[in-house]
């Protein structure tokens, strides 16, 4: 899923208010829902018919510093016999997400949102192309 | 995948610099990689053996304003004959993501990051529990 462009008005104050300095806004440091509990998956990446591996990228000037990317293990899907069936396809499920980028210039620190494309997992699909060559 | 808590030091300046005002930082309004191209999938939500629907939630004080949630259509998975097979399970693939929350207090506008749990799609898994009732 793709994040649309940020609208021109999103960072603006109401019309009746004095304009804000061009280019920067106030970011509160707390994070809403930071402690929300997430149901941990029960190894779905290995039990899936379109299994995947994870790779971790790390950047100390990004929040979250750790971004996890999935890679589909197979071209096809795993059948009931545990064999790869290439009449079906493993395909990545991708999601555009936001991260916060920290920027230093001497003692000046500012932050900026950054779009990152994350592959979250894989699913098994019927191929579109059914040619016989 | 779960986003870890933001570290205490992430919003701090280097030790040799004067401290920043408690609670808020400077957010640049541009978005890095805003124009990155995303390969659009070809209806994988309907072609998957664990197909899903999408529901859109809208909030004008959030960026992105539109957050799309997937719901698995079936308990089981779709077999080669196009029938639901409940010896396999459709399960959601979830991703914690960040959104930017806009907060108004009169003419004062500030922003805060918020964690949102997004169901991105579904995958077909072999069940762990194999009871016969």
């Amino acid at each position: 899923r793709k994040i649309p462009k940020v609208g021109h008005t999103f960072f603006q104050k109401p019309e009746s208010c004095p304009p804000v300095p061009e280019g920067s806004m106030k970011l509160d440091t707390g994070i809403i829902n930071e402690n929300q509990r997430v149901s941990m998956s029960r190894n779905i990446e290995s039990r899936s018919t379109s299994p995947w591996n994870y790779t971790v990228t790390w950047d100390p000037n990004r929040y979250p510093s750790e971004v996890v990317q999935a890679q589909c293990k197979h071209l096809g899907c795993i059948n009931a016999q545990g064999k790869e069936d290439i009449s079906m396809n493993s395909v990545p499920i991708q999601q555009e997400t936001l991260v916060l980028r920290r920027k230093h210039q001497g003692c000046s620190v500012s932050f900026q949102l950054e779009k990152v494309l994350v592959t979250v997992g894989c699913t098994c699909v019927t191929p579109v192309v059914h040619h016989v060559q | 995948r779960k986003i870890p808590k933001v570290g205490h030091t992430f919003f701090q300046k280097p030790e040799s610099c004067p401290p920043v005002p408690e609670g808020s930082m400077k957010l640049d309004t541009g978005i890095i990689n805003e124009n990155q191209r995303v390969s659009m999938s070809r209806n994988i939500e309907s072609r998957s053996t664990s197909p899903w629907n999408y529901t859109v939630t809208w909030d004008p004080n959030r960026y992105p304003s539109e957050v799309v949630q997937a719901q698995c259509k079936h308990l089981g998975c779709i077999n080669a004959q196009g029938k639901e097979d409940i010896s396999m399970n459709s399960v959601p693939i979830q991703q914690e993501t960040l959104v930017l929350r806009r907060k108004h207090q009169g003419c004062s506008v500030s922003f805060q990051l918020e964690k949102v749990l997004v169901t991105v799609g579904c995958t077909c898994v072999t069940p762990v529990v194999h009871h016969v009732q």
Epitope: S39, S41, R42 | W52, N53, T55, Q69, A70, Q71, C72, K73, H74, L75, G76, E84, I86, N89, S90, V91, P92, Q94, V116, L117, T119, V125, P127, V128, V129, H131, Q133
Partner: nanobody, 123 residues
């Protein structure tokens, strides 16, 4: 995290109908398979049926297929169980349950359970 609260139980005459509701709190209700179990006095907990996240797929235990109807309203974060032609043997505590996998839910291994609502059918 999901909290489940059942309601709608009570005393009903044999042959009557009842609709149970299960209100879920939590932002991702639609990502869960949800279903119903019941436990009669002195008996094991019994699976009634379940419904997929979108509501497109419903599975019933064979014995209840004709008299019980499961539905959900994701906009209201609510699961329903419509029961008709009730019999004395339907007397039980009815539990709502949620999990991201049908395989876990079906065999009573769900991650989330409600406290239950008592249904008593008098003959």
């Amino acid at each position: 995290e999901v909290q489940l609260v059942e309601s709608g139980g009570g005393l009903v005459q044999a042959g009557g109908s009842l609709r149970l509701s299960c209100a879920a709190s939590g932002r991702t209700f639609s990502s869960y398979v949800v279903g119903w179990f019941r436990q009669a006095p002195g008996k094991e907990r019994e699976f009634i049926g379940a419904i997929s996240g979108s509501g497109d797929s419903i599975y019933y235990a064979v014995s209840e297929k004709d008299r019980f109807t499961i539905s959900r309203d994701n906009g209201k974060n609510t699961l329903y169980l419509q029961m008709s032609s009730l019999k004395a043997e339907d007397t039980a505590v009815y539990y709502c349950t949620a999990d991201q996998e049908f395989g876990y839910l079906r065999f009573g291994r769900s991650e989330y359970w409600g406290q239950g609502t008592q249904v008593t059918v008098s003959s």
